[in-house]
Interface confidence: low
């Protein structure tokens, strides 16, 4: 890792599958930090402005995106699982934060979801449909 | 750890940003099940990790697969692992 070759991560949060919510009454958010080098990152989940540890599982170490390359960039994934009712509460705000060299990259689900009519409303009813 | 009532499933997730990454979540599987790495260099699969929902006294195994390939599908994401055929839950179609 020379001083010029430092790549910060791209961070993205993926929302729970409606199928999972219907099937299990639980909701798993996935955070991906990708394309970073070197492999020095710290990932954390924040719910309503507070860091959470319960329901969180993060890869123990980053994954080489191209294992054959000595200087491959890295990726890291993390899951946050909450109850379906907690996920469907539009007041709840979820954020994945990745610290890299002291810089902070993050992605989040904010409070702009419409309040669902029923507990099993589809993601599209929250204004998330790509249309 | 011992997972009570394993209920293995693969779910497709959607990103909050308009990106071309597809993510598949393999979850709630028994601890004896191993997750194999992908033979496709464009498909990334994590090792399994354990998640503990302490407030619900519930633990679950999970692994994540993702790719930027346009033809990447959750039905084939974990094809190198031994997963029952009834494990895959398709995402609901958009009603727009």
């Amino acid at each position: 890792e020379d001083l010029k070759k430092v790549f910060p991560p791209k961070v993205a949060v993926f929302e729970p599958s409606e199928a999972e919510i219907s099937h299990t009454q639980k909701a798993t958010l996935v955070c991906l930090a990708t394309g970073f080098y070197p492999d020095h990152v710290e990932l954390s989940w924040w719910v309503n402005g507070k860091e959470v540890h319960s329901g969180v599982s993060t890869d123990p170490q980053p994954l080489k995106e191209q294992p054959a390359l000595e200087d491959s960039r890295y990726s890291l994934s993390s899951r946050l699982r909450v109850s379906a009712t907690f996920w469907h509460n539009p007041r709840n705000h979820f954020r994945c934060q990745v610290q890299f060299y002291g810089l902070s990259e993050d992605d989040e689900w904010t409070e702009d979801r419409d309040k669902p009519i029923t507990q099993k409303i589809s993601a599209e009813a929250w204004g998330r449909a790509d249309c | 750890p011992y997972i009570q009532n394993p209920d293995p499933a693969v779910y497709q997730l959607r990103g909050s940003k308009s990106n071309d990454t597809s993510v598949c979540l393999f979850t709630d599987f028994d601890s004896v099940m191993n997750v194999s790495q992908s033979k496709d260099s464009d498909v990334h699969i994590t090792d399994k990790t354990v998640l503990d929902m302490r407030s619900m006294d519930f633990k679950s195994n999970g692994a994540v697969a993702w790719s930027n390939k346009s033809d990447f599908a959750c039905t084939s994401a974990f094809k190198d692992s031994v997963i029952p055929a009834d494990t895959f839950f398709p995402s609901p179609e958009s009603s727009c």
Partner: nanobody, 117 residues
Framework: EVQLVESGGGVVQPGGSLRLSCVAS????????YGWYRQAPGKEREKVAH???????DYADSAKGRFTISRDESKNTVYLQMNSLRPEDTALYYC???????????WGQGTLVTVSS
Amino acid sequence: EVQLVESGGGVVQPGGSLRLSCVASWEVHQINFYGWYRQAPGKEREKVAHISIGDQTDYADSAKGRFTISRDESKNTVYLQMNSLRPEDTALYYCRALSRIWPYDYWGQGTLVTVSS
């Protein structure tokens, strides 16, 4: 705050060996990355070697096969074993640590290595 103190520099003949040490004032589990860098007179600072999560190591081309980076967690110390030293290895050698504690990026004051006959 993390402080890094390097030692082990000195004057050595070509072909000789030196072992540099870098002691961190903070517990090693709070540090995800150690690196050794060097700066020769009139040149830019350059990477020599680093060791990071999972004890993965990486070396500059000029260090491969001659230098070895390692760490001893019980002593909060990272080492750079330098063998087959050459005159062009003469430089001020710096230790670097990336920490979980603000401000994250720490450098030592450096230890001078001179390779001369």
